[in-house]
Interface confidence: low
Amino acid sequence: LHQVWNGTVPEGSKPGTYVMTVTAIDADDPNALNGMLRYRIVSQAPSTPSPNMFTINNETGDIITVAAGLDREKVQQYTLIIQATDMEGNPTYGLSNTATAVITVTDVNDNPPEFTAMTFYGEVPENRVDIIVANLTVTDKDQPHTPAWNAVYRISGGDPTGRFAIQTDPNSNDGLVTVVKPIDFETNRMFVLTVAAENQVPLAKGIQHPPQSTATVSVTVIDVNENPYFAPNPKIIRQEEGLHAGTMLTTFTAQDPDRYMQQNIRYTKLSDPANWLKIDPVNGQITTIAVLDRESPNVKNNIYNATFLASDNGIPPMSGTGTLQIYLLDINDNAPQVLPQEAETCETPDPNSINITALDYDIDPNAGPFAFDLPLSPVTIKRNWTITRLNGDFAQLNLKIKFLEAGIYEVPIIITDSGNPPKSNISILRVKVCQCDSNGDCTDVDRIVGAGLGTGA
């Protein structure tokens, strides 16, 4: 039976490195002469770089290296034929047998990765990220798909703001240069990166990185048509309401980041809920086409929002939006009104009175405090009714006379705000005068439904 023994030895091992032990079995008494074995190497294949790379201890069967030059990248495996002879190896009287020792030379990281070119080239459109810019290729003589072969790439220069990164393709070992932060063509039109390649494990002792372990990557940035942008955005202006149509409010212009493209920007209106504005398509001048009204339902918290579009004529055309916020300062353009519009009171002045309040769509100081008054004409109004101001917003309307016949009366009330100049309004309060119980509640609703309309008398 021919035995095969397997062993390993790292490449580059020094002479005297232990490799493996082979042993033969003899049925004779190992202490008798015919059981004492001796070992020798009969042959070594291949015989490079020396025919005697290994030696065997003739008594123990220990195989050790005796020559330098083990190089996995040249010889990956040695096959030794080992002879064992009894009778202390006496070739005349001893019996012999042979076995095979297969010694595999294992890889160490004695070969650095080397770039296949001094310079690699790539290009990237501005503002794009997560795209592959360039493929870096290296060669490494160490065993593929091991830490001694797997390449690790790093950028050692030319990228101070960290716009690029390099990932390793696990199959090909290529370096994939990707963009991780957007690049602005107007700021950087080209990058020259210095890149280095190393392995996942350090190089073996005494091995240096050659110049081929570094390379340059020349990345050209491609100019892309970018969106024009308004600045500031939103633009806030303060303006009194009530401006007449045709008033120039402001100029709202956009900048185009594309300094190296000859382009024009045109302006259009996107949103103008009340249709108060127009924008000059060429110079961005915003002009009123209607009266601005702070009290419009389109104005929220005194602010009117309009949005505009700036479009360039690039290929493809790009656009950006901007919001104009007009903070409308109140003017006294609304006369106050009286609430409620209808009320109820008793035929006699006691026990109740009518509470009235002011409503003004303007805000301070163009609203309250309010003045309440009754008109001089018709004379019956002031004769029959009296109005008393409780505070800036409230007043009370009471019967002045001891009795007024049940019916429905229209009482005009003059209300004036505190604006400068003030605004006045005559509000008509429809007062239902009725017979009341002791609690001041109407008791004759049915009778009054058909009652005629009076003018306060």
């Epitope: 301070d364 100081p365 505070n391 800036g392 917003d393 400068n420």
Partner: antibody
Amino acid sequence: QVQLQQSGAELVKPGASVKLSCKASGFTFTDYLIQWVKQRSGQGLEWIGWFYPGSGSIKYNEKFKDKATLTADKSSNTVYMEISRLTSEDSAVYFCARRGDWGGFFDYWGQGTTLTVSS
Amino acid sequence: QIVLTQSPAIMSASLGERVTMTCTASSSVSSSYLHWYQQKPGSSPKLWIFSTSNLASGVPDRFSGSGSGTSYSLTINSMEAEDAATYYCHQYHRSLTFGAGTKLELK
């Protein structure tokens, strides 16, 4: 930046009057209402009234209309509040504040003036 | 005039606890005109929340405000030591009034 600087603490005898000031800076004085608020020790806030430098309009809380008088000096961007016929009930911290652009909130406040009425 | 009633008058909360205080108006108030202020002893009040739910500049986002009509509230979703203060609600819808305040203490 917007600031409302109030005059220093006052110790006044009962029956006398006192005039507190509130100097505005960092914004257009005539665009905003200046409010006055009273706070007695350990108590809540009580609105006294407002002054509108743009037109000279004034509005008082009914409770204070015979107690406080609001005036202003546009040249120095200062609003004044005179409190008359002082009693111990008037001892309090008085704040001036600016009414914001919308909703009526008070967006900036003075540091307050402490008024002590004591004989 | 509109009366604002704040409840509770005094409350205490542990660090990390959720806190809610309420402000009830005697008649309906537009949400645009209901505001909250924070005041610490010896300091001026500070605008804290305006128009019911908008946080003033510099106010941490653990604060929020909500409500409509006559019922409004201020909530702190996780109490911190610096939140101990008195909080006042304020309306400018009809005339101008403040609530009596809710004093929030650290437990």
